[in-house]
C-alpha cells in the first residue's frame, strides 16, 4: 500500500524537481518499499512496497527497488529469501562449505584422528591426529578423539593397549580367573595437557574430483553462482509450451553443463566482487546469485546516493 | 527429530487425478529443495520431481512431465504433488525426500502407495 | 541425461565378508553421488553422501569411494542387518538419477 506518513526520525534525500527545476528535501521511504511519487512544494513523498522479486534493505529515496539474486543454483539453499527488506542468500547444504566457489564435502578425518574444529558453511573440518590416551576408529567429520576405557575404574586389567586407532581392550586378571573376557571401551592414560598435535591439511582427505571440472564442464574456473537460465526469465519447465525444458536442467556442481546453445539458451555466468551486490556493506554471505537482466542495468544499482 | 509424512495415495482409475501432501517436521522447511521420489512394485528407485526453495522453480523426470505438478507451501511446512491423466505405470510407492548433505536425500518419508488400475 | 549402471544387480555373501558394489556414470558428476540400503517395505536410508562421506549415524564398517565417472561402496565386515538392497545415486544434475540397484542376499 503506498505509504505517505512522515516519521520524525527518517532521513532526507534532495531531489530536483523536474516541472520548476526546484530542489527540494524530501523523506525518505522505509526499507522494504520505494518512492513511488517524489515530494513537491505542497504534497509528501508516496512510498510503496517492493514488488515480488525485488528488495530494498535501507531507507531510501530510490524509484525502483532492487531486482533480488537469481535463485540459488543447486544444490544450495535459500539461507535468506528474497523478501521486500532482504536479498536472497545461498548457502551449501549442511555437511559441505564453500570452497573454490562451489560447494565442496567436510573434511573426513580419517582412523586415528579426530574433528579439532568442526566445519561450517563456509570453512572446512580442521582435523587433528588423536593425542596420547585418545583414539578415533571411524573416519568421521563430526567425531573428536576419544578418550581410552578406563579398565581400572571397572575392575579389569588393560590386556591391550589402546593406540590412536584403537581403544583399550579390557579384561581380567589371569589369577581371578581362568579366561579373558576382553571388553573394548574410555581412557587409562590421562590426556597429556601440552602435547604437540598434528594438523592433516584439509586437501589431504577431501574427496577427489570435489574440485575437478570433469562433469562436461565448460568453465574451468567455476563462478561464484552460475545461473544457466533465460535472461529475464524464471525458469519452470512445467508447461511444454514455454519451450523451456532444457534450460537451467544442470545447475547442480554450479559449472556450466554441456546445454545446447541457441538464440533462446544464453547462460549467464557473473563473478560477484564481494561488494558488488551489497550497496557497499560487506556481506558475510557465503553466496549470491547474479541479478536479473543485463549485466550493465544493475551496475549503478546497489550504490545509490538516495539510499544512504 | 525430522519427519516426513505423505499422504493422499489410494486406488485410482487411468486418466484420473490424485494430490499427494507430504507434512515436515523437526527442521526449517523453507530453505530446503524438496523432491519427490517414487518406486514402482519390486522395481527400483525413480526421481519424480524436485522443487527451488521458495517455489516457483520446478524440475521433472522425462516420465512425468506436463501430467505431474510439484508445489509447496511453506507456510503449512508442506510439499505436494499434483498428478493427472495418471497411467497404470505409475503405480508405485512415491515417498517425499529432502535433499540435505550433500545434495543427497538425507530424509524420507514412509511413502504412500498409488495404485492405477481399471 | 546421466545413466547409473551399478554391479552386480544381485550378491550372496555370509556375515563378516568384505561386500564391494560399483556404481558407474555415463558421463563425470565429479563427486556428487549418494549410496542408499533399502529393506523392503522401507523407506531407502542414506549411507553414504559426496562419494566418500558417511551419514551420521551410520556404522563404520560402510565405505565410499570414487569420483568422476567410476564408484564404489564397501561394507568392510558384513553384519546380519546388512542384508538389503542398496541404490547409488547421482546429484550432479537434473533430472537425478538412481542404479538399477544390488541386493545383497545371505549365501
Known amino acids: 500500500q503506498p505509504e505517505q506518513k512522515a516519521s520524525n526520525l527518517i532521513g532526507t534525500y534532495r531531489h530536483v524537481d523536474r516541472a520548476t527545476g526546484q530542489v527540494l528535501t524530501c523523506d525518505k521511504c522505509p526499507a522494504g518499499t520505494y518512492v513511488s511519487e517524489h515530494c513537491t512544494n505542497t504534497s509528501l513523498r508516496v512510498c510503496s512496497s517492493c514488488p515480488v522479486g525485488t528488495f530494498t534493505r535501507h531507507e531510501n529515496g530510490i524509484e525502483k527497488c532492487h531486482d533480488c539474486s537469481q535463485p540459488c543454483p543447486w544444490p544450495m539453499i535459500e539461507k535468506l529469501p528474497c523478501a521486500a527488506l532482504t536479498d536472497r542468500e545461498c548457502t551449501c547444504p549442511p555437511g559441505m562449505f564453500q570452497s573454490n566457489a562451489t560447494c565442496a564435502p567436510h573434511t573426513v578425518c580419517p582412523v586415528g584422528w579426530g574433528v579439532r574444529k568442526k566445519g561450517t558453511e563456509t570453512e572446512d573440518v580442521r582435523c587433528k591426529q588423536c593425542a596420547r590416551g585418545t583414539f578415533s576408529d571411524v573416519p568421521s567429520s563430526v567425531m573428536k578423539c576419544k578418550a581410552y576405557t578406563d579398565c581400572l575404574s571397572q575392575n579389569l586389567v588393560v590386556i591391550k593397549p589402546g593406540t590412536k586407532e584403537t581403544d583399550n581392550v579390557c579384561g581380567t586378571l589371569p589369577s581371578f580367573s581362568s579366561s579373558t573376557s576382553p571388553s573394548p571401551g574410555t581412557a587409562i592414560f590421562p590426556r597429556p595437557e601440552h602435547m604437540e598435535t598434528h594438523e592433516v591439511p584439509s586437501s589431504t582427505y577431501v574427496p577427489k574430483g570435489m574440485n575437478s571440472t570433469e562433469s562436461n564442464s565448460s568453465a574451468s574456473v567455476r563462478p561464484k553462482v552460475l545461473s544457466s537460465i533465460q535472461e529475464g526469465t524464471v525458469p519452470d519447465n512445467t508447461s511444454s509450451a514455454r519451450g523451456k525444458e532444457d534450460v537451467n536442467k544442470t545447475l547442480p556442481n554450479l559449472q556450466v553443463v554441456n546445454h545446447q546453445q541457441g538464440p533462446h539458451h544464453r547462460h549467464i555466468l557473473k563473478l560477484l566482487p564481494s561488494m558488488e551486490a551489497t550497496g557497499g556493506e560487506k556481506s558475510s554471505t557465503p553466496i549470491k546469485g547474479p541479478k536479473r537482466g543485463h549485466p550493465r542495468q544493475n551496475l549503478h544499482k546497489h550504490f545509490d546516493i538516495n539510499e544512504h | 527429530e525430522v519427519q516426513l509424512l505423505e499422504s493422499g495415495g489410494g486406488l485410482v482409475q487411468p486418466g484420473g487425478s490424485l494430490r499427494l501432501s507430504c507434512a515436515a517436521s523437526g527442521f526449517t522447511f523453507s530453505p530446503y529443495w524438496m523432491s519427490w521420489v517414487r518406486q514402482a512394485p519390486g522395481k527400483g528407485l525413480e526421481w519424480v520431481s524436485v522443487i527451488y526453495p521458495s517455489g516457483g522453480h520446478t524440475y521433472y523426470a522425462d516420465s512425468v512431465k506436463g501430467r505431474f505438478t510439484i508445489s509447496r507451501d511453506n507456510s503449512k511446512n508442506t510439499l505436494y504433488l499434483q498428478m493427472n491423466s495418471l497411467r497404470a505405470e505409475d503405480t508405485a510407492v512415491y515417498y517425499c525426500?529432502?535433499?540435505?548433505?550433500?545434495?543427497?536425500?538425507?530424509?524420507w518419508g514412509p511413502g504412500t502407495l498409488v495404485t492405477v488400475s481399471s | 541425461d546421466i545413466q547409473m549402471t551399478q554391479s552386480p544387480s544381485s550378491v550372496s555373501a555370509s556375515v563378516g565378508d568384505r561386500v564391494t558394489i560399483t556404481c558407474r556414470a555415463s558421463?563425470?558428476?565429479?563427486?556428487?553421488l549418494a549410496w542408499y540400503q533399502q529393506k523392503p517395505g522401507k523407506a531407502p536410508k542414506l549411507l553414504i553422501y559426496?562419494?566418500?562421506s558417511l551419514q551420521s549415524g551410520v556404522p563404520s564398517r560402510f565405505s565410499g569411494s570414487g569420483s568422476g565417472t567410476d564408484f564404489t561402496l564397501t561394507i568392510s565386515s558384513l553384519q546380519p542387518e546388512d542384508f538389503a538392497t542398496y541404490y547409488c545415486q547421482q546429484a550432479n544434475s537434473f533430472p537425478l538419477t538412481f542404479g538399477g540397484g544390488t541386493k545383497v542376499e545371505i549365501k
Open positions: 559426496a562419494a566418500s
Open positions: 525426500a529432502r535433499p540435505g548433505f550433500g545434495a543427497a536425500f538425507d530424509y
Open positions: 558421463q563425470g558428476i565429479s563427486s556428487w
